[in-house]
């Protein structure tokens, strides 16, 4: 007799990452009977919502529904109709909304209100929209990459099934760079975590993890640029800002009101004798690097050692996955290869920043000028943050792996968030008894 294919017993989950610069929707899929196994959940779709981050809709909240439509309709198409009602939808908002909340809780609530109303209209099981903490963002990013790298699996393998796998169970650290914040998360080596705010304890698959994490609000690449501009315009003699972080020949007019709109520039705010100023690029990596370093206060540390701004940071340990904007920026600059040393990266950045703007525009004709103009700053910022901020060295640079995807799933906090909320990471190692063995095959 012919074997009939059984309908696949799968489940789906949807997570929306409402970041400061944009929103992305991720669809995950897993075999229903293997929920407690490690590494079985994978991403089947990413849909980038057209437009800015949700915090930018504060004066036009009525447009949020339309903004989310395309990607939510895409989810309707990808997920079988029979599964819609049992598919959870989570929205997590990150540093863009944390900043808006700092400015006005009422405005942040208005945005979340319209987001909830919009997402509740779809046939899925809406599970709330919330502003996640920086600590969660770091922790879930760490869980995501280690889950995808198979670090929580108890089965030791003599062969590698995923890139970067070193066949040991040492977890990877996680380095996440967004537009408004950046997170560093790792398991320190036998080191006491001196500040309780930075300490997390997990029990995952029968093993205990003492994890260090910190989220630096205002130190995402976009907010760091606003900070740098606000700092530098203080000492400008007129409404011209000669900026080493932009290519020679680049020009852009900035409104002072836009500069001081974000809480991240409050510390540099002053009354200026002009409403606008013009950035004029001079394209000098070294000067750009020096200007960026002034954003990191390293003169004060109440602990045995700090990153910057008085924040405790234990000695770096092991390998790190650097993802989100760490990856996107370095990928654009063609600097993600494991073979490229830190010295080579610095050399390449010096050359790139010194290239005239007209030349850059010709070489990268397909790239939006808004993004293209900021790669010199962003690349320099990444180097400054990793080397001076987090104390990576030329030697330890080789332990940083710039990762976009692992096994087809994006590196980032969303998968870890969903795994946690769907209770798919057991504290104890699931038992494989002879009776239930087929479940684990």
């Amino acid at each position: 007799t012919q074997n009939k294919a059984l309908p696949e017993n799968v489940k789906y989950g949807i997570v929306l990452d409402a970041g400061s610069s944009h929103t992305s929707l991720y669809i995950y899929k897993w075999p229903a009977e293997k929920e407690n196994d490690t590494g079985v959940v994978h991403q089947v779709e990413e849909c980038r919502v057209k437009g800015p981050g949700i915090s930018k809709f504060v004066q036009k909240v009525n447009e949020i529904g339309i903004y989310l439509t395309d990607c939510m309709e895409r989810a309707r198409e990808v997920i079988p109709r029979s599964q819609h009602q049992e598919t959870p939808v989570y929205l997590g908002a990150t540093a863009g909304m944390r900043l808006l909340r700092m400015e006005s809780e009422e405005l942040a609530d208005r945005v979340l209100d319209v987001v909830e109303r919009s997402l509740s209209n779809y046939p899925f099981d809406f599970q709330g929209a919330r502003i996640i903490t920086g600590q969660e963002e770091g922790a879930y990013g760490w869980i995501t990459i280690n889950y995808l790298l198979g670090k929580f699996s108890q089965k030791t393998r003599w062969f590698s099934i995923v890139p970067y796998e070193t066949n040991n169970q040492e977890t990877f650290g996680a380095l996440d760079l967004g537009g408004a914040s950046t997170q560093v998360t790792f398991v320190p080596q036998n080191q006491t975590i001196e500040s309780p705010d930075n300490a997390l304890q997990f029990r995952l698959y029968g093993k205990d993890y003492n994890v260090y994490t910190h989220s630096f609000l205002c130190y995402g690449k976009d907010q760091a640029l606003w900070q740098k501009l606000a700092k530098d315009i203080q000492v400008a003699s007129n409404e011209i800002l000669r900026d080493p972080c932009f290519h020679p020949g680049y020009k852009k007019v900035v409104n002072v009101s836009d500069l001081y709109k974000t809480p991240c520039t409050k510390r540099f705010e002053m009354t200026l004798p002009f409403q606008q100023f013009e950035i004029q690029g001079i394209g000098n990596y070294q000067q750009c690097h020096q200007s960026i370093l002034e954003l990191f206060n390293t003169s004060y540390c109440p602990y045995s050692q700090c990153a910057f701004n008085g924040i405790f940071l234990p000695p770096l340990q092991g390998d790190f996955g650097a993802f989100s904007a760490f990856y996107f920026v370095m990928k654009f600059l063609n600097l993600t290869s494991e073979k490229v040393s830190q010295e080579k990266v610095t050399e390449m950045m010096k050359k790139f920043c010194a290239q005239p703007w007209e030349e850059i525009k010709t070489s990268y004709a397909g790239v939006k000028e808004k993004y293209l103009s900021e790669y010199c700053f962003s690349g320099t910022y990444i180097l400054s943050l990793l080397l001076q901020g987090y104390h990576f060295t030329a030697d330890s640079w080789e332990h940083i792996h710039f990762i976009g995807k692992i096994q087809g799933s994006d590196a980032g906090w969303t998968l870890g968030y969903m795994l946690n909320l769907t209770n798919m990471i057991p504290a104890e190692q699931p038992l494989s008894t002879p009776l239930s063995h087929s479940t684990y095959v």
Partner: nanobody
Framework: QLQLVESGGGLVQPGGSLRLSCAAS????????MSWYRQAPGKAREWVGS????????TYQNSVKGRFTISRDNAKNTLYLQMNNLKPEDTGVYYC????????RGQGTQVTVSS
């Protein structure tokens, strides 16, 4: 300072009802949307539902739709959760939060559904 105090929990049989309350102080209650969350032992904290600042709109997760009702009295700075036809899987600690907050601030109130 900002305070949210939940009350009204208890032991109830399957099919029974409970009404939880949340007394709010230290902020302008009528300006913010509110949410209820719950956490069962060994499980992640789970969103139950939300209500808008004015109380004109509510939304719920699927498993409680038609059984739970969130309401608010802005004059009394109080949020409510009416729970009917309770099931054993509704057991957990229930927390109220301001929708803009990342985590509950109160101690929560224990709801146990058991025969």
């Amino acid at each position: 300072q900002l305070q949210l105090v939940e009350s009204g929990g208890g032991l109830v049989q399957p099919g029974g009802s409970l009404r939880l309350s949340c007394a709010a102080s230290g902020f302008t209650f009528s300006n913010l949307g509110m949410s209820w969350y719950r956490q069962a032992p060994g499980k992640a904290r789970e969103w139950v539902g939300s209500i808008s600042a004015s109380g004109d709109y509510t939304t719920y997760q699927n498993s409680v739709k038609g059984r739970f009702t969130i309401s608010r009295d802005n004059a009394k700075n109080t949020l409510y959760l009416q729970m009917n036809n309770l099931k054993p899987e509704d057991t957990g600690v229930y927390y109220c939060t301001r929708r803009v907050d990342s985590y509950p601030r109160g101690q929560g109130t224990q709801v146990t559904v058991s025969s």
